[in-house]
């Protein structure tokens, strides 16, 4: 069955950024990925990267740098440029549309009692979507 | 099938403004972008900037910060671009596109002229 | 910004002629993590706008005749017409599509000899 995880990791040189790490495991070829925030995409989430493996990358504020780390697996480095830190309690999705498969989403966040530089552990959550 | 339709030729004078918009169909206009582009005769093709309607999102080249300011209407499933302080050097041709490019208008051409 | 360079500005040819032009661009368009290049090549023509042909470097948007070869990885990039129809007679545009912003080349416009 595939599978999606996330990880929310703080920098621990600069504590106002933040990298969300999403990857895909299962069969089927990646057609794209969207990293939403707040909720999953479509359900109360905030857009912040589409990337198509192929064409390109979308990115927008407070997103940094999307990039793909893998074939199936990508990047997204946020900038806090407020004083407060909102990305510690907010929630991070990745949706990864693969054929023939499907659209799969999973969430993450980063934990409370993260130390600098820790990630969070995998967190599987399918939210399955025959898309 | 994926269709970007633009409003029409515009005729305006220096100093002005104008919006010009952008009415998508066939795909979910929340889900992409709407870049827009900028197209003089040997000149080629300009990156202005982007918006992604629903959050209303922006990225503007920084040579057009100040010129473009992007807007989008997810109830009727159109973007527009208005262009302030309107000189010559503004008359082009003006592409919507979605899709990472893969989809484009049919242009608008704005002429700026006294 | 990546700077776009493409070469030669104008090409005159043959019906049948195999034709070559060049893209170069000022930084790599290679994503390591998962060895794509982010380069797309855009024909138009007289009072048209841009068509997608290649993207990826490579892979040839769905309808485009399978003549149009797109080549090339990092900075060096190629677009081959393997034989010139004239319906190919147009504007040649290849772009960066690795990094914000966008930016595109001036062009290489194909004429008939």
């Known amino acids: 069955t595939p599978e999606v995880w996330v990880q929310v990791q703080m920098e621990a040189t600069e504590l106002s950024s933040f990298t969300v790490h999403c990857g895909f495991l299962g069969p089927g070829s990646i057609s794209l990925v969207t990293v939403s925030w707040g909720g999953p995409d479509g359900a109360g989430g905030t857009k912040l990267a589409v990337l198509h493996p192929e064409l390109g990358t979308r990115q927008w504020a407070p997103a940094r740098q999307a990039r793909w780390e893998t074939q199936s697996s990508i990047s997204l480095a946020l900038e806090d440029s407020g004083a407060s830190s909102p990305f510690a309690n907010t929630t991070f999705c990745c949706k990864f549309a693969s054929f023939p498969e499907g659209s799969w989403e999973s969430c993450g966040s980063l934990p409370p009692s993260s130390d600098p530089g820790l990630s969070a552990p995998p967190t599987p959550v399918p939210i399955l979507r025959a898309d | 099938q994926v269709q970007l339709q633009q409003s029409g030729a515009e005729l305006v004078k220096p100093g002005a403004s104008v919006k010009i918009s952008c009415k998508a169909t066939?795909?979910?206009?929340?889900?992409?972008?709407i870049e827009w582009v900028k197209q003089r005769p040997g000149h080629g093709l300009a990156w202005i900037g982007e918006?992604?309607?629903?959050?209303?999102?922006?990225n503007y080249n920084e040579k057009f910060k100040g010129k473009a300011t992007f807007t989008a209407d997810t109830s009727s499933n159109t973007a527009y671009m208005q262009l302030s302080s309107l000189t010559s050097e503004d008359s082009a041709v003006y592409y919507c596109?979605?899709?990472?490019?893969?989809?484009w208008g049919q242009g608008t051409l704005v002429t700026v002229s006294a | 910004d990546i700077v776009m360079t493409q070469s030669p500005s104008s090409l005159s040819v043959s019906a049948g002629e195999k034709v070559t032009m060049s893209c170069k661009s000022s930084?790599?368009?290679?994503?390591?993590?998962?060895?794509?290049?982010?380069l797309a090549w855009y024909q138009q023509k007289p009072g048209q706008p841009p068509k997608l042909l290649i993207y990826?470097?490579?892979t040839r948007e769905s309808g485009v005749p399978d003549r149009f070869t797109g080549s090339g990885s990092g900075t060096d990039f190629t677009l081959t017409i393997s034989s010139v129809q004239a319906e190919d007679l147009a504007v040649y545009y290849c772009?960066?599509?690795?990094?914000?912003?966008?930016t595109f080349a001036a062009g290489t416009k194909l004429e008939l000899k």
């Open positions: 990826g470097a490579s």
């Open positions: 066939g795909y979910t206009f929340s889900s992409f972008s």
């Open positions: 596109s979605s899709y990472w490019f893969a989809y």
């Open positions: 930084q790599s368009l290679l994503n390591s993590g998962n060895q794509k290049n982010y």
């Open positions: 772009q960066n599509a690795h990094s914000y912003p966008p």
């Open positions: 918006i992604l309607p629903g959050s209303n999102s922006t």
